[in-house]
Amino acid sequence: QKSSIEKCSVDIQQSRNKTTERPGLLNCPIYWQQLREKCLLFSHTVNPWNNSLADCSTKESSLLLIRDKDELIHTQNLIRDKAILFWIGLNFSLSEKNWKWINGSFLNSNDLEIRGDAKENSCISISQTSVYSEYCSTEIRWICQKELTPVRNKVYPDS
């Protein structure tokens, strides 16, 4: 039995998979900030987690996925005030009783030190300094991401 948030996450991910392949993204769109091989968009408005998830999807992006502690720190360095919380693409899966990224993978316990409870209707937010479990219905800001396509040097055969 999947929660409504899990269903929403799966539905959006499936619809994204169905869309036709687009050319790779070489540069970040206007208003998006480049962080290594990603483009990030920090919202100025607030939403519950599932609305944030949907908003990123409409922008042909996803809620932020964080690979490791290093990426977390670099993302946190872009947050301008300690009193701003941002949703990322991680929530508690009741069926698997574990933190689950919206791409279907589970959280490596060493990656993020989460402050707060791991329980139903809990979603993950980040601030300038920490990672928090908050109720998914809480209205806070969110971060969308787009992956940049690495530019490869073309090798032409001798003519």
Partner: antibody, heavy 119, light 107 residues
């Protein structure tokens, strides 16, 4: 209907302690950041402290940092402010308000509770 | 810390009159500016949030404008119940700060 009701104010000597409470009803308490805001007699409004919906994240205004502690019990729909090492300049009406994480406005306020610090 | 400066500190106006209160931030705060009304012995009440959005239940005679550092609260036709003190507040950065207040009195 959203309601916030503060209690716990009173007269306390300098250096003393007091704990304020704010009972919330009419909304999903755990989904909202909450704040304390104070107003000294005849003066303007001063933000004191805020706490996230889960209670995991807190922050404070410089004049109260290290002396005041904000907390919440979501099972009781109650917000608290533990005030230690009280000073005369802490004398004010203390309001609890819904909101407190940027860019929240304070959309609902309690009626306030008066804290008087005097010997 | 961002300083918020309101002007005037007080004003006298007649019922039916138009009132304008200004608020200036010491640095740009985008549109993260709220306006509150407070009557003696009562808690503040949110009127306007995000510089120009009217809070639910607030009469349409109240309006807000501005962005960056300069903001305005306008009461288009002052009513007897509008005599009160008005505060601006920024929610751009911590600490959250308020203006010193503008008292609107009956002429």
């Amino acid at each position: 209907e959203v309601q916030l009701v503060e209690s716990g104010g009173g007269l306390v000597q300098p250096g003393g302690s007091l704990r304020l409470s704010c009972a919330a009803s009419g909304f999903t308490f755990s989904s909202y950041a909450m704040s304390w805001v104070r107003q000294a007699p005849g003066k303007g409004l001063e933000w004191v402290s805020a706490i996230s919906g889960s209670g995991g994240s807190t922050y404070y205004a410089d004049p109260v940092k290290g002396r005041f502690t904000i907390s919440r019990d979501n099972s009781k729909n109650t917000l608290y402010l533990q005030m230690n090492s009280l000073r005369a300049e802490d004398t004010a009406v203390y309001y609890c308000a819904r909101g407190g994480y940027l860019p929240d406005a304070f959309d609902y306020w309690g009626q306030g509770t008066l804290v008087t610090v005097s010997s | 810390e961002i300083q918020m400066t309101q002007s005037p500190s007080s004003l006298s106006a007649s019922v039916g009159g138009r009132v304008t209160i200004t608020c200036r931030a010491s640095q740009s705060i985008s549109s993260y500016l709220n306006w509150y009304q407070q009557k003696p012995g009562k808690a503040p009440k949110l009127l306007i949030y995000a510089a120009s959005s009217l809070q639910s239940g607030v009469p349409s005679r109240f309006s807000g404008s501005g962005s960056g550092t300069d903001f305005t609260l306008t009461i288009s036709s002052l009513q007897p119940e509008d005599f009160a003190t008005y505060y601006c507040q920024q929610t751009y950065s911590t600490p959250l700060t308020f203006g010193q207040g503008t008292k609107v009195e009956i002429k």
